[in-house]
């Protein structure tokens, strides 16, 4: 969480951003809030990116003002116009690119003053893993697959029964480059699985951590997946 202050006229206003991560090829949100102002026509929102000459986005007098927008963001940005009046300056970024990573500034002007805060935006790829029993294998085997990751993650297996056990000797992980030549498909196989146990396949890079759980009993198989972004710090 980054909280910034600015001084203008009577007041400085508080602007708050939250560091976040974008999943390349998908839409992302750069989060920014500010002390709301009841005078919508006086509110100006500017998004800037370090090292980029033009603006990322500008909203003023109740609408987008994109005449000074940098080419790399053309047609890819939008604020939540209906939410500006209640202090939401968050930016929607369409079709996130690897090159969108960097330091952004959310700069706000209202009738009460000015303020800004920086935001670290990481980009990569992350996806939910799915763990299945591999019935084609000669022994009881689990197969963990996740379709899109970047940068290359680590994969670690864990078990509820054998807590703390190291499964690296009985697992095999491969990374297969996807067609766009950036992201990779993650496949990890765990051998010598016992029933009546819960196994977890944990995939992690510097952006996200995802876990796929599978519980195998004689009568049923239960699965659960969870994904967590690692860098959601507010400013």
């Amino acid at each position: 969480l980054i909280i910034g202050f600015g001084i203008s006229g009577r007041h400085s206003i508080t602007v708050t951003t939250v560091a976040s991560a974008g999943n390349i090829g998908e839409d992302g949100i750069l989060s920014c809030t500010f002390e709301p102002d009841i005078k919508l026509s006086d509110i100006v929102i500017q998004w800037l990116k370090e090292g980029v000459l033009g603006l990322v986005h500008e909203f003023k007098e109740g609408k987008d003002e994109l005449s000074e927008q940098d080419e790399m963001f053309r047609g890819r940005t939008a604020v939540f116009a209906d939410q500006v009046i209640v202090g939401n300056a968050s930016l929607r970024l369409k079709n996130v690119q690897l090159t969108d990573a960097g330091t952004y500034k959310c700069y706000i002007i209202t009738s009460k003053g000015k303020g800004n805060a920086n935001l670290e935006y990481k980009t990569g790829a992350f996806s939910m893993p799915e763990v299945n029993v591999d019935y084609n294998a000669s022994s009881e085997t689990l197969r963990c697959e996740a379709p899109r990751w970047f940068p290359q993650p680590t994969v670690v297996w864990a078990s509820q029964v054998d807590q703390g056990a190291n499964f690296s000797e009985v697992s095999n992980t491969s990374f297969e480059l996807n067609s766009e030549n950036v992201t990779m498909k993650v496949v990890s196989v765990l051998y010598n699985v016992t029933i009546n146990n819960t196994y977890s396949c944990m995939i992690e890079n510097d952006i996200a951590k995802a876990t796929g759980d599978i519980k195998v009993t004689e009568s049923e198989i239960k699965r659960r997946s969870h994904l967590q972004l690692l860098n959601s710090k507010a400013s």
């Epitope: 709301p36 009841i38 919508l40 026509s41 109740g62 116009a81 209906d82 009046i85 209640v86 009460k112």
Partner: antibody, heavy 117, light 107 residues
Framework: EVQLVQSGAEVKKPGASVKVSCKVS????????MHWVRQAPGQGLEWIGA????????EYAPKFQGRVTLTADTSTSTAYMELSSLRSEDTAVYYC??????????WGQGTTVTVSS | DIQMTQSPSSLSASVGDRVTITCQAT??????LNWYQQKPGKPPKFAIY???QLAEGVPSRFSGSGSGTDYTLTISSLQPEDFATYYC?????????FGGGTKVEIK
Amino acid sequence: EVQLVQSGAEVKKPGASVKVSCKVSGYPFTSYWMHWVRQAPGQGLEWIGAIYPGKSDTEYAPKFQGRVTLTADTSTSTAYMELSSLRSEDTAVYYCTSTWTHYFDYWGQGTTVTVSS
Amino acid sequence: DIQMTQSPSSLSASVGDRVTITCQATQDIVKSLNWYQQKPGKPPKFAIYYTAQLAEGVPSRFSGSGSGTDYTLTISSLQPEDFATYYCLQFYEFPPTFGGGTKVEIK
């Protein structure tokens, strides 16, 4: 659940003052503007003013400037509207209304103020 | 101040009718317009925000449209519970201003 609960009806004499309260629950009171709107019998809605409780910033409609005072007690999440030098044309239902998710999204139940000699 | 002219001031309609209410601003309000429904003895109820977005719990027979200075609230098929007074509100320029209201009555 968001709730704005206002104080009860008041009967006042011309020249007197009235203070109406609005107790808020269900959202962060200090971080959003609270507005006051009134409605004379059989008439439309008229904006009086607004307060930002976190900083006690206030904005008033020019018509009410100098005669209305908006305050807030952040410890009890209660907003107050005081109108002075009352006259018969101030007879109305007075509403508090929040701007939490959108402009005037939640409303109090209203407080009837009657000014009569 | 921006003036909001709402029309008609009242209308009579039957259940099932399509009803249209308009609000005209004295200048461009850039879609910064909400609609409220009020029944006798009750506070106004938030119905439509930012010209066309339905508030939570509002039936899909209600819709809003418009841009610039001209805005419309439409009820596609009037239901018994829709008989009420409707107000528009502009919040683009300070101070916020309401339209004069439209009373929708049973024919």
